[in-house]
């Protein structure tokens, strides 16, 4: 069971300081942006992180949403990352969900965050370069200290 608590507005960056945004095709991508660029590209750079209380003491459960014309919420259904047109629900009567991630700080680095899928244990949100694009993907943690699964979360409230 997950019960929604509160939400905050955040900018999410990878460790190369690239900003996460949702492009015109609804794809989550990372791009180099100045602070001014980041503001100019809002709301596509502003993510709604909704926190949930979990029936199992596993960590801070969150959903990640964005509001452009409508609210879309990040999903890792079938281990594929996409934004689905939906509001973060008030509660989820299950112990796993494709839209719930556990946000945890990296041990020894309180300002760096990881997002582990509640549906796929050991799988984390990650940044991966594909051709010229830096994409948000779901990746199995395969090595300690993998920087691709670490992010900074800057509150905008």
């Amino acid at each position: 069971y997950f019960g929604k608590l509160e939400s905050k507005l955040s900018v999410i960056r990878n460790l190369n300081d690239q900003v996460l945004f949702i492009d015109q095709g609804n794809r989550p991508l990372f791009e180099d942006m100045t602070d001014s660029d980041c503001r100019d590209n809002a709301p596509r750079t502003i993510f709604i992180i909704s926190m949930y209380k979990d029936s199992q003491p596993r960590g801070m459960a969150v959903t990640i949403s964005v509001k452009c014309e409508k609210i879309s919420t990040l999903s890792c259904e079938n281990k594929i990352i996409s934004f689905k047109e939906m509001n973060p629900p008030d509660n989820i009567k299950d112990t796993k969900s494709d839209i719930i991630f556990f946000q945890r700080s990296v041990p020894g680095h309180d300002n760096k965050m990881q997002f582990e899928s509640s549906s796929y244990e050991g799988y984390f949100l990650a940044c991966e370069k594909e051709r010229d694009l830096f994409k948000l993907i779901l990746k199995k943690e395969d090595e300690l200290g993998d920087r691709s699964i670490m992010f900074t979360v800057q509150n905008e409230d």
Epitope: Y1, L5, K53, S55, M60
Partner: antibody, heavy 125, light 107 residues
Framework: QVQLQESGPGLVKPSETLSLTCTVS??????????WSWIRQPPGKGLEWIGS???????YYNPSLKSRVTISGDTSKNQFSLKLSSVTAADTAVYYC?????????????????WGRGTLVTVSS | DIQMTQSPSTLSASVGDRVTITCRAS??????LAWYQQKPGKAPKVLIY???TLESGVPSRFSGSGSGTEFTLTISSLQPDDFATYYC?????????FGQGTKLEIK
């Protein structure tokens, strides 16, 4: 009403494994709705959650101790146990077992509502 | 992890006084906060959960308030039995974390 009682050696040598047992009376650890938890308190200091176990056997640990902690349950004896490996003097503390109502959308949850009396474990050679 | 910071660390007061202890969470925890009382050589005892709900059997002189990151425990009229150490605790997100404690002593 539910009562909890810790037991185990009061002295453990550095680098060895600390082992404690909590015996539950007046209630069953195998009925749902509660986690069974361990908390510790170094002398003159604050409280630290070590971890919890659910009746299903699922365990949840404080990340700061996870690599050294094992919590297990024995439903036939109505007991749950703590093992903490590779102890140092910093692990000297009063160790408490406690009951924790689980969260399923209600308010009365995730605090420690029933505690044992605590047992002092000293790590020293 | 969510850090819980209490103030003051020590509080001197007299029987009959109204006292307030403050607890600050390092990030918002809605109203998911508990208060415990601990006397020397004893296990902690829960007084309040969900920030303001009084545990059964706890005297009504104890009250809690706050949400988000700022919380308070108030004792409206101190009784001799109330001199103890008080802890706030995050019960929103694991790992469950406690404040460092506020020792309430006789002035």
């Amino acid at each position: 009403q539910v009562q909890l009682q810790e037991s185990g050696p009061g002295l453990v040598k550095p680098s060895e494994t600390l082992s404690l047992t909590c015996t539950v009376s007046g209630g069953s650890i195998s009925s749902g709705g509660y986690y069974w938890s361990w908390i510790r308190q170094p002398p003159g200091k604050g409280l630290e959650w070590i971890g919890s176990i659910y009746y299903s056997g699922s365990t949840y640990y404080n990340p700061s101790l996870k690599s050294r902690v094992t919590i297990s349950g024995d439903t036939s004896k109505n007991q749950f146990s703590l093992k903490l490996s590779s102890v140092t003097a910093a692990d000297t503390a009063v160790y408490y077992c406690a009951r924790t109502p689980a969260y399923f959308g209600q308010d009365r949850t995730d605090f420690f509502d029933v505690w044992g009396r605590g047992t002092l474990v000293t790590v020293s050679s | 992890d969510i850090q819980m910071t209490q103030s003051p660390s020590t509080l001197s007061a007299s029987v009959g006084d109204r006292v307030t202890i403050t607890c600050r969470a390092s990030q918002g925890i809605s109203s998911w906060l508990a208060w415990y009382q601990q006397k020397p050589g004893k296990a902690p005892k829960v007084l309040i959960y969900k920030a303001s709900t009084l545990e059964s059997g706890v005297p009504s002189r104890f009250s809690g308030s706050g949400s988000g990151t700022e919380f308070t425990l108030t004792i409206s009229s101190l009784q001799p039995d109330d001199f103890a150490t008080y802890y706030c605790a995050n019960i929103a997100f694991p790992p469950w974390t406690f404040g460092q404690g506020t020792k309430l002593e006789i002035k």
